[in-house]
């Protein structure tokens, strides 16, 4: 039998810093864009190489995005999100969610939502 | 990983229509950014037409002569091409990415783009 899946949310001030080209990632999600089932958040679906959030380091594909300079990022249309990183301005504080997956039970044995398998 | 595949090429006439399709895997389809490009015999690669979340773009050489649209639940993109001219001959590559730029989108330049298709060849005589 498979071990549980569980996964390990933790929570994470970014400050970033608007680049040549931007801040460097793409967002899925909102309220007429939900990504994941019952949640109309923000996330994060693409970061860009040499971008000012991959040369970072610390926002990951799959983080969700909770605010922007402070801004609630909750029941917001997608191009309203879309836009509001666009007018976020030069120096941009990012409050996200990491979810880490954490694999329990036998090992050896892999659940079936790990991709590494 | 997303695999994308286009149909719908072939030989027409001036004048002529031809309709291309890009199936795409994936179950969340709907917030894929999608583009189509073409590349002709010794050219560079050429950006046509374009969809996001927001709307759709046109490259100049196109506009009024061709139509992007998507059906979300059939996971396809399609490019109506009507009057098509002998220089629309091209191999016709669909590009895509999963979500939107929260950067200045620019429908043209490749690298916004994730996923290609291998290319589906229209021949316009």
């Known amino acids: 039998m498979n071990g549980r899946v569980d996964y390990l949310v933790t929570e994470e001030e970014i400050n970033l810093t608007r680049g040549p080209s931007g801040l460097g990632f793409n967002i899925v999600g909102g309220t007429d864009q939900q990504y994941v089932s019952n949640d109309s958040g923000i996330y994060v679906s693409r970061i860009k190489e040499n971008g000012a959030a991959a040369l970072d380091g610390r926002l990951q594909e799959g983080d969700k995005i909770l605010s922007v300079n402070g801004q609630d990022l909750k029941n917001l249309l997608h191009q309203d999100a879309v836009d509001l990183f666009r007018n976020a301005g030069y120096a941009v504080s990012l409050r996200v969610q990491h979810r880490l997956q954490v694999q329990n039970g036998p090992i050896g044995h892999r659940g079936e939502g790990d991709p590494s398998g | 990983q997303v695999q994308l595949v286009e149909s719908g090429g072939g030989s027409v006439q001036a004048g002529g229509s031809l309709r291309l399709s890009c199936t795409a895997s994936?179950?969340?389809?709907?917030?894929?950014?999608m583009a189509w490009f073409r590349q002709a015999p010794g050219k560079e690669r050429e950006f046509v037409a374009a969809?996001?979340?927001?709307?759709?773009y046109y490259a100049d050489s196109v506009t009024g002569r061709f139509t992007i649209s998507r059906d979300n639940a059939k996971n396809t993109m399609y490019l109506q091409m009507n009057s098509l001219k002998p220089e629309d001959t091209a191999v016709y590559y669909c590009?895509?990415?999963?979500?939107?730029?929260?950067?200045?989108?620019?429908?043209?330049?490749?690298?916004?783009?994730?996923?290609w298709g291998q290319g589906t060849q229209v021949t316009v005589s």
């Open positions: 994936g179950r969340t389809f709907s917030t894929y950014t």
């Open positions: 590009a895509a990415v999963i979500g939107s730029t929260v950067d200045s989108y620019r429908p043209g330049d490749p690298l916004e783009y994730d996923y």
């Open positions: 969809i996001s979340w927001s709307g759709a």
